[in-house]
Structures are given as C-alpha cells and as structure tokens.
C-alpha cells in the first residue's frame, strides 16, 4: 500500500537508502512488507502513504531503522484492517466502491460489506 501513491515522497527509494546505511545492524530491514492480503480505497491509500512518509522521516533524522519492523507489524495487524473496514462500510461505502490491492496497486470494483459484517452487534 505504502508504495502505490504519492510518488513524490519516493518511499521505496528512501527505504532502500535507509536500509543500505544500516545493513550491518538490520538484516531484515530491506525485506519488503507483504501487504498483499489488503486492499484500500484512494483516501486510505493516501493516508497510509503519508503516515509512512512521516515515520521514515523520523528514521532518517534519527538514522535508525530499528522500529521499522514494529511499524510494519502495526500496519498489518491494526491500521490496515481498520482502513479496510472503513472503506467497505457506511458511511464511506454504499453499494460498491473501488479498492486498490496493496501489493499490485491495481483497482477493482467491490461490493460493500453487508450489515452484519460492518455492525456485528446490530
């Protein structure tokens, strides 16, 4: 997801540079996060890209990438599922919407989630 939008931020290039500087200490740094299970809408895609941009900026200033794995983990376990639910439930979604695969960045028209999935208690 984080590499699909806002090319001016050059996230993939910056991540590669950060990792090459820290390679000796962070063997797993360059491993690209696998977000292929997720798909987000345009708004969420931009938000997660902006968030990652800010996180990388802090790491560039501090010259440290030790917190990168935990950031990827937080995205996978918490933020991306939140974004997915937001994108596929009202008020953001009524009927259908376009989601972009986090791995391929390809857009697909999908149906919104049904009531019980959006509001399990209803």
């Amino acid at each position: 997801c984080v590499f699909c939008r806002l090319p001016a931020h050059d996230l993939s290039g910056r991540l590669a540079r950060l990792c090459s500087q820290m390679e000796a200490r962070q063997k797993e740094c360059g491993a690209s996060p696998d977000f292929s299970a997720f798909a987000l809408d345009e708004v969420s895609m931009n938000k997660v890209t902006e968030k990652t941009h800010r996180v990388l900026r802090v790491m560039e200033i501090k010259e440290a990438v030790s917190s990168l794995p935990s950031y990827w983990s937080w995205l996978r376990k918490t933020k991306l599922p939140e974004y997915t639910r937001e994108a596929l439930c009202p008020p953001a979604c009524r009927g259908s919407t376009t989601l972009y695969n986090c791995s391929t960045c390809k857009g697909t028209e999908v149906s919104c989630w049904p009531r019980k999935r959006c509001f399990p208690g209803s």
Epitope: K47, E82, E86, C89, P90, P91, R94, F119, S122
Partner: antibody, heavy 117, light 107 residues
Framework: EVQLVESGGDLVKPGGSLKLSCAAS????????MSWVRQTPDKRLEWVAT????????YYPDILKGRFTISRENAKNTLYLQMSSLKSEDTAMYFC??????????WGQGTSVTVSS | DIQMTQSPSSLSASLGERVSLTCRAS??????LNWLQQEPDGTIKRLIY???SLDSGVPKRFSGSRSGSDYSLTISSLESEDFVDYYC?????????FGGGTKLEIK
C-alpha cells in the same frame, strides 16, 4: 442506552468561530460513523458533515467545505465540529447523530448556535 | 444534489384516521430512505430505515413503502402522540438531503 449530548453552542458574531462537542455513551464509539445535522429557524433540516469510524473519511456539503471541520477523538468518545467564518445563515440548532448501516439512527438533543452582531 | 420533495407540508387529521406522507426523490436513491419523527421538544427519532424497515420500539401502526421515485410513510390509526413533525432523509449519496417536513395536526 445510546446517549449523545451536544455542547458548545453560543451566540457569536459574524466572522467568528465556535467549536461544538458531542459526548457519546452507551455504545462502542469507534465502531460507528458520526454526523452533524442542523435545523434552521424555519425548521428545515440540513446535513452538515459526516466522519467515518476512525476519521479517515470526512464528508461535507459543498457550501460548508473549508469553513466547517468535523473530527473525532475515539479515546474520549467525543465528536467535534469546528466552525469558522460564521454567517447569519449558520444560525441553527446543531444535532449530532450516530451513523449505522442506514444513516443516522440515534440523535442528540441539539445545541443552539446564533450568529448575530 | 438529490432533491427530496415532501408533501403535504401540513396535514390535519383525526384520532384513529389512516394517513400517508410522501417524499419524491429527484434521482434514483434505491431503498436508501429513512423517515424521522421530531417531537415538540426537538427530540428526533428514526422511525423507518431503508424505505420499509421499522426501527426497534416503533409501533406497528407505522409503515414505509415505495412506488418508483415516491416514498410513503403510512400511519394506520393515528394516536395522540403521533401529532408531531415528520421528515424523510435520503442517504444514497452525499450530500444527504432531507424533505421539507410534514406537520401533522389534530383536527
């Protein structure tokens, strides 16, 4: 029991600003979208803004974009409406409402905003 | 924007009478229409969602239906507490839009 309590309404001069709050209780706040709706003195209802569960998506009518900002603080179970460059036509009772699958299911009692010099 | 034209704007009726209020949508909104009730103290309550589904706790005398672009709220037998204001709301697409309201008065 779902409860929504608005506050912050006041008498304000044209061009002024105001921030309304809506305290929510009786449900898991972060799992619902929220909206603001206003009722003008002639009793017309007008939709003002809507925000998604975590605030990623916000929606406004074109006439209010740029002047009004909806936000939420899930940790405090609170919804906000920041209003700026207020005009006399913004005079209304402002209601917050919870958004379920089919738009607004629960409404607050409202807070009164009067814009006058 | 989708215009919701609600009629009548006011209606006088007697206890026990059957009445219908109508909202006409200027564009297709599918079943994305609610009916709201507002009491004299300003309290707003949703009565019907998705055109015809009754909210919990709403008396069975209230019902909703659709015929093309016309949406109706019917009260089968008016009771004293029903003489208040009613509004329709379309939520098919943003901006949400409301009908102008119907004031139901006792004859």
């Amino acid at each position: 029991e779902v409860q929504l309590v608005e506050s912050g309404g006041d008498l304000v001069k044209p061009g002024g600003s105001l921030k309304l709050s809506c305290a929510a209780s009786g449900f898991t706040f972060s799992t619902y979208g929220m909206s603001w709706v206003r009722q003008t003195p002639d009793k017309r209802l007008e939709w003002v803004a809507t925000i998604s569960f975590y605030g990623t998506h916000t929606y406004y009518p074109d006439i209010l974009k740029g002047r009004f900002t909806i936000s939420r603080e899930n940790a405090k179970n609170t919804l906000y409406l920041q209003m700026s460059s207020l005009k006399s036509e913004d005079t209304a009772m402002y209601f917050c409402a919870r958004e379920d699958y089919d738009a607004m299911d629960y409404w607050g009692q409202g807070t009164s905003v009067t814009v006058s010099s | 924007d989708i215009q919701m034209t609600q009629s009548p704007s006011s209606l006088s009726a007697s206890l026990g009478e059957r009445v219908s209020l109508t909202c006409r949508a200027s564009q297709d909104i599918g079943s994305n229409l609610n009916w709201l009730q507002q009491e004299p103290d300003g309290t707003i309550k949703r009565l019907i969602y998705a055109t015809s589904s009754l909210d919990s706790g709403v008396p069975k005398r209230f019902s909703g239906s659709r015929s093309g672009s016309d949406y109706s709220l019917t009260i089968s037998s008016l009771e004293s507490e029903d003489f208040v204001d009613y509004y329709c709301l379309q939520y098919a697409i943003f901006p949400y839009t409301f009908g102008g309201g119907t004031k139901l008065e006792i004859k």
